[in-house]
Structures are given as C-alpha cells and as structure tokens.
C-alpha cells in the first residue's frame, strides 16, 4: 500500500494560507474597488456562458490573443491582472466538467510519467553542458561575446523545459496554440555559424562552436520528438474555429460593452441588482452548448477551495504548463546574455525551471502510487 | 541568504486546531517545495508531507491524512501548516524544510527553527 | 513503507578515532540523505545523495553505500562531532527517517 496522499489544491493567483479566512465577496480584497469587482464577475459570467473551453485557453495561452483582448476591451491593467486570474480557476473549472479534457488530462499524465524521467536526464545534461560552455569561455576571455550561441541554445531549452515539463502543451500546426517563436529552429541552426571574437583563438572557438552545436541538435530532436506526440494528440482537440484575431477581439469588445453598461449601472441607485444583457456575443464553436458550471463558484474557487475528491491532479497540468510558459520570458530575454556570467544565471533559472517540473513529477508519481 | 522563519510556540487545548507558519526569503518561493516533519520527544523525525508553493499540489504521508493540512500564500512566501483535533500525541517540534533540488532529490537544504507545540488543558 | 533502521542506536569513541554508523533499509534505496542534530537545534543537511557533503561540512566525513545497507564514517573523530545523526530516503513514498545513531565523545 503506498504510504503517501496526493492532493491538488485549485491554484488561484493570491493563494491564502486560510482560505476560509475572507468572506466571499472579498476574493480581489486589496487589488480592486467594489465595482470592479462586480465587473469581473460580470465578466466570468460571459465567459461561462459564451465562450467555449477551447477559446478560453487560447486567450490564456497566446500571449498575443491576450494583449489583443485587453486592448479590445480597454482594460486597466489591475482589472486585466485580476480577469486573469478569475479565467485561469475558470478555465480550470470547465476542463473539469468536461469529459473530453479529463481522458486527454489522464493521456497527457501517462505521456509525461512515463517520458519525463529521460527527457530530465537529458536536460541535465544540457544544462551542465551550458555551464561547461560558459566556464569555456570565462577561460579564454572573460569579455567574450556569446550572444549568439546562448540564444541559439538556450532559447530552445526554455521551449523545451515549459513544452516538455508536463508533457502537454498545446502545441499545433496551423497557428493554433503555438507556444515557441515561429522560426526558432531557423535562427538556432544561424545561431551556430554565429561566434567569432578575435579574443578567441581557433581551437576554442571551434570547441565552443562544437558544444552549442551538439547541444542544439539534441535540443531539436527532442523538441521534434514532443511535437509529434502533441501532434497526433492534441491538434484535433485544440483546434479553433474562426480566426484567432476577429475571436480575440470580438470578445473584447463584448466585453468592454460589459464594463461599460456595468459603470453606468452603478451610476443609477438600485440598479446594481440587473444584470448588463450583452447583445450578439461571441459564441462557443459552431453549434456547440457549454454547460453552465454552478457548483463550486468562481468565487469559491479563487479562495482556494480544494477541489481534490473532484478533481484528479492531471485536469490542471495544461495550465500548469501555461503558467510556466509565461514565466519563462525573461529566459527568451536573458538567452542574449553576453557574458559567461550572465550565462551561469541562465543556467541556474533553467536548472530552477527544471525544478519546478520535478516537483510536479513527483506529485504526480506519488498520485499515480495511490 | 536563505532563510526559513517559524512562527512560535503554541500552547493549546485537546480536540482544538491550530496552524503555523513559515516564512520563506532569500529564493524563488515557488521553484522549491516545502516539506514538514514532526519531532516527537527530541528523537523521532515523521514526514508529514511536501506542498508545491508553485500550484499548491501537495503529498501527504498517510499517517497524518486528516490530522495536517498544508497549504501556502505565494504574495507573501509562506507555507502553512494546520493541524486539526489535536490531542497529547500532537505534542511535538515541527519544522518546515525546503525541498532541495533535483539532483539531491528528497534531501531538505533548509531547515526553519521549530515550532514547539504543547497540546495540554 | 520503506524502514530506515540506523546503527548502533548510541557510539561511543574517542577523539582522533575512526568511527562508522550505518543505515539498513526494509527494501533497496536509491540512495540516502543525512542530518546532524545537535540539541535544542534544527536538524543540517549534512550528506546529500549517500556520498555528497554539504557546504561547511569537513571533510573528514564520507559516505556511502548503495541498494539496503549505506553508511556514515568520521575519519578522526572530533569534539564537535558530538551530535545525533539521522539518514533519510525517499525512493518511495513516504519519505522516510532512520530512527538516529547519537555520537558521544569518550
């Protein structure tokens, strides 16, 4: 008998450490004025009722379709920041009352239990390598340029350590939901014939070349190798209807209608009761209903509400993978480091990177024991 | 500098809950699990279990299911550990570890200072 | 469970003597951890991995072994070694600690 319990607590953007603590209401306490909250309930309401699962984690996946969205519906940015965090629980609650997403969430956890033990092993050594990579270059010049190595490979790594971590990015062909720069493979295979310093005498230029060029090609391949497998798996299930910006945008508008009508209720006393009807919205793909999510609120959830006799740990892992994704930007940023310092501090935040998905292996591992 | 602050001891009744807190500084909270062990008579270690501070997952060592709750605040980098129904046996020293990376994996690097509990009426 | 079973439970030496502890579990173990606690204190990491000192250990500490049966030696042994020692697993769930080998200094 495994002598280990696992529980998935609901993330929420403020985790509490009491989450009984706030009174319901106060979910945004501190950030928000009353009518801004109001709004965003108003606003999680729409998304409940009108926007399909699919295009809701395409807005919280794409970084653009986001920004779009914002702009759309000219969001200040604390009500931007708090809508995040009420779509991301939201999202979270829709994949679980959602039967196609809990069979692909098992399918992607069986994936990634099985895969990551191999694919940790060999971003190990990746990240050694870069250390090596950096230490070489410390030796030969302290100054050295190494822009374009470091871009080339650290870049993929990043891609790498967010798509690969959970084993479940959503990653398709056609523009979907594409995580890593369209390119990329392009610009690291130029990245290689990039270092030349007139500090670097032959052999180690050539030695470092070496290194990087390994490292990449690796790299690739395993990125080729999760492609294919979220390929077959997922571009079926992700795919969206209509074009990425008119949706975006669309929803933006409703739901800067939303906000609007929501401030000039407030204005009128007693109004606040009625709800802003937004006309025309933008509905779910062709054809299909969204069930209305009741139990437990989005308010609830964004308490902290555990959620765990409902919900297996694997119905989050999209987000999870989400999450790490948007926290990986400043990586993209720091891979045109040019120093071998600023190499090390790359590689110490992959190796982090790295950590973090361990610690959801192990979750994961011990849940799968149970 | 890493850092791992507890809060203080605590004096409590049987049959009443209680929790305490950790205090994480000088890292990334969310890159490192926390653990919590219990320390029974100056002798005995028990994990109680490990919670995720990234996505709040956690593992319970199934001799405390229903007796500790872990859970953690991000804003504020702290974990939190709530044990319930306390009785004499809950008398003990817990502390709160840091998970250390993954090469060591299991190890705990940083340990907080201990909170003594002292179940009593 | 996996059980952690440290011997002896209490060692007893002399400074400048070569002492070992050791540290048997119920099943095989990747590898084990372990931690110096002296009294009234937290417990340190003090081996990480069966053979990996950690910062500020001396380095007249080793450790190793590997599948049940790992271990603990002090080459010389030293007045401030004077602690107990506790070796830890977690190849499976739970993580588990050995009960405690306490070092005394004749």
């Known amino acids: 008998e495994a002598g280990a319990r696992v529980q998935q607590n609901v993330p929420s953007g403020t985790d509490t450490g009491d989450p009984q603590s706030k009174p319901l209401g106060d979910w945004a306490a501190g950030t928000m004025d009353p009518e801004s909250s109001i709004f965003i309930e108003d606003a999680i309401k729409y998304f409940k009722e009108k926007v399909s699962t699919q295009n809701l984690l395409l807005l919280l996946t794409d970084n653009e379709a986001w920004n779009g969205f914002v702009a759309a519906a000219e969001l200040p940015r604390n009500e931007a920041d708090e809508l995040r965090k009420a779509l991301d629980n939201l999202a979270r609650q829709m994949i679980m009352k959602d039967k196609n997403w809990h069979d692909k969430g098992q399918q992607y956890r069986n994936w990634f239990l099985k895969e990551f033990p191999r694919l940790k092993s060999e971003l190990e050594d990746n990240i050694r390598r870069l250390r090596a990579l950096a230490d070489g270059v410390q030796k030969v010049h302290k100054g050295t340029t190494i822009a374009n190595v470091v871009s080339g490979s650290l870049s993929i790594s990043s891609g790498i350590l967010t798509l690969v971590g959970m084993g479940l990015a959503p990653f398709t062909e056609g523009g979907s939901l594409v995580l890593l720069e369209p390119g990329m493979e392009l610009g690291i295979t130029a990245a290689l014939t990039g270092i030349t310093s007139s500090t670097m005498d032959y052999g180690k230029k050539w030695w470092t070349q070496a290194q990087a060029h390994d490292l990449v090609i690796k790299s690739l391949d395993k990125l080729k190798e999760v492609r294919e497998f979220l390929g077959e798996n997922i571009s079926n299930f992700l795919s969206l209807a209509g074009n990425t910006y008119q949706l975006t945008r669309g929803i933006g508008k409703d739901i800067r209608a939303l906000r609007r009508a929501r401030a000039n209720l407030q204005s009128v006393p007693h109004a606040s009761a009625s709800r802003p009807r937004v006309t025309e919205p933008i509905s779910a793909e062709s054809g299909e209903q969204v069930e209305r999510v009741n139990e437990p609120s989005i308010l609830e959830m964004s308490r902290g509400v555990k959620l765990t006799d409902v919900a297996p740990v694997g119905f989050f892992l999209v987000l999870d993978v989400v999450y790490l994704v948007y926290e990986s930007k400043h990586l993209h940023e720091g891979a045109k480091s040019e120093t071998a310092e600023e190499l090390k501090k790359v590689a110490q935040e992959l190796e982090e990177k790295l950590n973090m998905l361990n610690n959801n292996y192990k979750i994961l591992q011990a849940d799968q024991e149970l | 500098e890493v850092q791992v602050q507890q809060s203080g001891p605590e004096l409590v009744k049987p049959g009443a809950s209680m929790k305490i807190s950790c205090k994480a500084s000088g890292y990334s909270f969310i890159v490192y699990t926390m653990n919590w062990v219990k320390q029974s008579h100056g002798k005995n270690l028990e994990w109680i279990g490990l919670i995720n501070p990234y996505n709040g997952g956690t593992i319970y060592n199934r001799k405390f299911k229903g007796k500790a709750t872990l859970t953690v605040d991000k804003s504020s980098s702290t974990a939190y550990l709530e044990l319930l129904s306390l009785t004499s046996e809950d008398s003990a020293v817990y502390y709160c570890?840091?998970?250390?990376?993954?090469?060591?994996?299991?190890?705990?690097?940083?340990w907080g200072q201990g909170t003594s509990v002292i179940v009593s009426s | 469970q996996i059980v952690l079973s440290q011997f002896p439970a209490i060692l007893s030496a002399s400074p400048g003597e070569k002492v070992t502890m050791t540290c048997r579990a119920s099943s095989s173990v990747i590898y084990v951890h372990w931690y110096q606690q002296k009294p009234g204190s937290s417990p340190k990491p003090w081996i990480y991995a069966t053979s990996n000192l950690a910062s500020g250990v001396p380095a007249r500490f080793s450790g190793s072994g590997s599948g049940t049966s790992h271990s603990l030696t002090i080459s010389r042994l030293e007045a401030e070694d004077t602690a107990t020692y506790y070796c830890?697993?977690?190849?499976?769930?739970?993580?588990?600690f050995g009960a405690g080998t306490k070092l005394e200094i004749k």
């Open positions: 570890a840091r998970g250390a990376l993954y090469r060591y994996e299991g190890a705990m690097d940083y």
């Open positions: 830890q697993q977690w190849s499976s769930n739970p993580l588990t």
